[in-house]
Amino acid sequence: ARNGDHCPLGPGRCCRLHTVRASLEDLGWADWVLSPREVQVTMCIGACPSQFRAANMHAQIKTSLHRLKPDTVPAPCCVPASYNPMVLIQKTDTGVSLQTYDDLLAKDCHCI
Amino acid sequence: ARNGDHCPLGPGRCCRLHTVRASLEDLGWADWVLSPREVQVTMCIGACPSQFRAANMHAQIKTSLHRLKPDTVPAPCCVPASYNPMVLIQKTDTGVSLQTYDDLLAKDCHCI
């Protein structure tokens, strides 16, 4: 269940997809990834106010308990709901290989 | 890929399964759930330091970029990796029904 997509905190403040440009050095990949030389990393960033993009029943419970016990129970967190695949050209012991990663770039976000 | 399970912050401080006792009133369910009258909610709580229980490549990237740009990129977040089903006895328009929820109780946790 995907709940409200209206952000009560103001435009762009709630859980959504962001793009962060990162070099291979930034990612600690310079030794084993040869291409791409720079990655447009899509990730989920932002607040998860009450019922905003609640992923499931667990997220709804978390929202309720966070309201009651904010020091014990954290608010739901903005995480990927799905991913886009990405092909990396990697260094191997004897050469290079193409490898597809299915869990690297966030495609869509929700709160959980 | 599940990375290190050793918590560098001290025992119990990192991402793990916690149980929080909640009444139907706490959960806002008093109107539609008849049983159980109290729920032992299992949820994922705790910090996600570098590579601790990293769920996938995306989590590893997030760790690297959080270290570089802590004001822009948040640290990975402790969320359920899987769920335990739970049966609720619910009020319906004409009586009661048993409903199984597959996404209510966290079973296992990871960082993403």
Epitope: D31, S35, R37, I89, K91, T94, G95, S97 | -
Partner: antibody, heavy 111, light 111 residues
Framework: VKESEGRLVTPGTPLTLTCTAS????????MSWVRQAPGKGLEWIGF?????RAYYTSWVNGRFTISKTSTTVDLKITSPTTEDTATYFC??????????WGPGTLVTVSS | AIDMTQTPSPVSATVGGTVTISCQSS????????LAWYQQKPGQPPKLLIY???TLASGVPSRFKGSGSGTQFTLTISDVQCADAATYYC???????????FGGGTEVVVK
């Protein structure tokens, strides 16, 4: 980048050439060694990763060893023969071309 | 080993004209475009002109153009200048490290 001074060595006497870099960090870049025999074409010996892992082309066959420290990239000619007489170049890069080259250093192997 | 065949030397060019050098590989380079072109003048190290088959290296005049993919590549120099007299090399990166290397070189003579 700059290679250490080349020299005259006798066959079988190991020789190490050192490459130093300024203006960029060796720990962030792949580095390559290339050689050129007098009047001949370029031969790619091998390359080393940012962390220091070395890789070689087929003809090398154990005759060379590339290593890396935080400040230098070394090429060891394990047992030089007269065929190893050449100008040796150190260069920055691997996959996207070798974009910065040293002036080269002449190694002469002769008895 | 991979055979990288370049246009036989020497290639004659006239000032203001256009010259084309080809490089043919017996195997496809990585990604179809991991090929670079270099210019070398006597007594100097090579200079990177083109990388990724068609990307102009920093500071290189747009008179130099790289094209091609897979196994067949071309370097075109338009509006040839006297300063373009040099030997030109292609170099490829392959799936196996042991195959990486340079073409035999093509000398361009400017009249």
């Amino acid at each position: 980048v700059k290679e250490s001074e080349g020299r005259l060595v006798t066959p079988g006497t190991p020789l190490t050439l050192t490459c130093t870099a300024s203006g960029f960090s060796l720990s962030s870049h792949w580095m390559s060694w290339v050689r050129q025999a007098p009047g001949k074409g370029l031969e790619w010996i091998g390359f080393v990763s940012p962390s220091g892992r070395a890789y070689y082309t087929s003809w090398v066959n154990g005759r060379f060893t590339i290593s890396k420290t935080s400040t230098t990239v070394d090429l060891k000619i394990t047992s030089p023969t007269t065929e190893d007489t050449a100008t040796y170049f150190c260069a920055r890069g691997y996959t996207s071309g070798l974009d910065i080259w040293g002036p080269g250093t002449l190694v002469t192997v002769s008895s | 080993a991979i055979d990288m065949t370049q246009t036989p030397s020497p290639v004659s060019a006239t000032v203001g004209g256009t010259v084309t050098i080809s490089c043919q590989s017996s195997k496809s380079v990585v990604n179809g475009d991991w090929l670079a072109w270099y210019q070398q003048k006597p007594g100097q190290p090579p200079k990177l002109l083109i990388y990724d088959a068609a990307t102009l290296a920093s500071g290189v005049p747009s008179r130099f153009k790289g094209s091609g993919s897979g196994t067949q590549f071309t370097l075109t120099i338009s509006d040839v200048q006297c300063a373009d007299a040099a030997t030109y090399y292609c170099a490829g990166v392959y799936n196996n490290d042991s195959d990486n290397g340079f073409g035999g070189g093509t000398e361009v003579v400017v009249k």
